[in-house]
């Protein structure tokens, strides 16, 4: 068992490899055709370590001339994956990440998949479809979400520290009951943020404090019984 005066509880959510997609089935394509074409850009939060499937505009493949996926990742040259229907050829330029691939053969499915999403997959993804009727495109601002590791411990008299380590975006920390708190954020080069909240409770009838961490990947609460003030022996409540 951990010592009450040191770290009491930690949590890191485990996720089985889930898959997320904004793609639509054929029925939806028929119903939403004009709507989807109008929605050119989509912001899309995706949990790290899941699989993601990104879709082109819902255009029948028989009408296609060229499909191009343009991928702009931070600090990297723009990568393009193109498929030309007439010659049935695919071409890649500046694409080094082997986890970003066509879902299947592009002549059968124009969707793009990211296997095991990583922080480095944060960026802008755009599908451009060239047809005799014009060019259609659909873009995704992919925001990779990272679940923070949460810890709660005491470091001195009636003072507790709650940390949400390496979350993306930054987590929000609140306390029950409210204390006299100071919050700091530490930004890491990979885009994650550590939030540290240190609180003190002067009120002596506060027995246990709860740290509540709110995050886009889910919320987590930890609690800890406060240690007695040194020298305090007996009190009536």
């Amino acid at each position: 068992q951990p010592n009450n005066s040191l770290m009491l509880q930690t949590s890191k959510e485990n996720h089985a490899l889930a898959s997320s997609s904004l793609c639509m089935d054929e029925k939806q394509i028929t119903q939403n055709y004009s709507k989807v074409l109008a929605e050119v850009n989509t912001s899309w939060p995706v949990k790290m370590a899941t699989n993601a499937v990104l879709c082109c505009p819902p255009i029948a493949l028989r009408n296609l001339i060229i499909i191009t996926w343009e991928i702009i990742l931070r600090g990297q040259p723009s990568c393009t994956k193109a498929y030309k229907k007439e010659t049935n050829e695919t071409k890649e330029t500046n694409c080094t990440d082997e986890r970003i691939t066509w879902v299947s053969r592009p002549d059968q499915n124009s969707d793009l998949q990211i296997r095991t999403v990583a922080i480095t997959h944060d960026g802008y993804y755009r599908c451009i479809m060239v047809t005799p009727d014009g060019n259609f495109h659909r873009g995704y601002h992919l925001q990779v979400l990272v679940t923070p590791e949460v810890t709660l411990f005491q470091n001195r008299n009636r003072t507790a520290v709650c940390k949400a380590v390496a979350g993306k975006p930054a987590a929000h920390i609140s306390w029950i009951p409210e204390g006299d708190c100071a919050t700091k954020q530490e930004y890491w080069s990979n885009g994650t943020v550590t939030v540290k909240s240190t609180c003190h409770w002067e009120v002596h009838n506060v027995s246990t404090v709860t740290c509540h961490v709110s995050h886009l990947t889910g919320n987590k609460s930890l609690y800890i019984e406060l240690l007695p003030v040194p020298g305090a022996k007996k009190s009536a409540k």
């Epitope: 068992q1 951990p2 010592n3 009450n4 005066s5 029950i176 009951p177 409210e178 002596h204 009838n205 506060v206 027995s207 246990t208 404090v209 709860t210 609460s221 930890l222 609690y223 800890i224 019984e225 240690l227 007695p228 003030v229 040194p230 305090a232 022996k233 007996k234 009190s235 409540k237």
Partner: antibody, heavy 114, light 107 residues
Framework: QVQLVQSGSELKKPGASVKLSCKAS????????MHWVKQAPGQGLEWIGN????????NYDEKFQGRATLTVDTSTRTAYMELSSLRSEDSAVYYC???????WGRGTLVTVSS | DVQMTQSPSSLSVSVGDRVTMTCQAS??????LHWFQQKPGKAPKLLIS???NLEDGVPSRFSGSRYGTAFTLTISSLQDEDIATYFC?????????FGQGTKLEIK
């Protein structure tokens, strides 16, 4: 796995005192508050007080202040609750609990009768 | 002291029912709590710690949630062995205080 083993049932006369014990294992005894709770027959639960074995710091509910005495023996990892000037309304099951109320003993039945 | 108001005090139920009970702290005081199950002659058994964390070995039909300063224990589909008294314990403030209990009885 935290275990709290409580002493056996007690039959006492009004005005007497009783001392209950609670022996802990499976956790750092001196690092967690030990609490005592009363449950009278057919009644709800009442918090009596708590003691921090690492320092001997104690809190009592006002209702039990002066009649309940909480102590610990860290060498045997045992917490004690003594209740004095017993009366019939003290007849109840008394529980010790620790780990922020997540681990409970099985309780000790105290019967006060003349 | 923080008073815990638990409702209902008793409930007539049938196997398969969805059962809900609530605890609320006096004056809407923000607190944290545990939920316990108690059967006659037995010590309370912890079901849910910290308002919503299901304890190991507790069936998934039990769940706890927080709505502001109100807390709910839900049994999604009642089983015979769930007939018992349920109570909450707030552990944020001294003195710790308990709900008066919700007793489940078979119709």
């Amino acid at each position: 796995q935290v275990q709290l083993v409580q002493s056996g049932s007690e039959l006492k006369k009004p005005g007497a005192s009783v001392k209950l014990s609670c022996k802990a294992s499976g956790h750092t005894f001196t690092s967690y508050w030990m609490h005592w709770v009363k449950q009278a027959p057919g009644q709800g639960l009442e918090w009596i007080g708590n003691i921090y074995p690492g320092s001997g710091s104690i809190n009592y509910d006002e209702k039990f202040q002066g009649r309940a005495t909480l102590t610990v023996d860290t060498s045997t990892r045992t917490a004690y609750m003594e209740l004095s000037s017993l009366r019939s309304e003290d007849s109840a099951v008394y529980y010790c609990l620790t780990m922020t109320g997540t681990s409970w003993g099985r309780g000790t039945l105290v019967t006060v009768s003349s | 002291d923080v008073q815990m108001t638990q409702s209902p005090s008793s409930l007539s139920v049938s196997v398969g029912d969805r059962v809900t009970m609530t605890c609320q702290a006096s004056q809407g005081t923000p607190i944290n709590l545990h939920w316990f199950q108690q059967k006659p002659g037995k010590a309370p058994k912890l079901l849910i710690s910290g308002a919503s964390n299901l304890e190991d070995g507790v069936p998934s039909r039990f769940s706890g949630s927080r709505y502001g300063t109100a807390f709910t224990l839900t049994i999604s589909s009642l089983q015979d062995e769930d007939i018992a008294t349920y109570f909450c314990l707030q552990f944020t403030y001294i003195p710790w205080t308990f709900g008066q209990g919700t007793k489940l009885e078979i119709k």
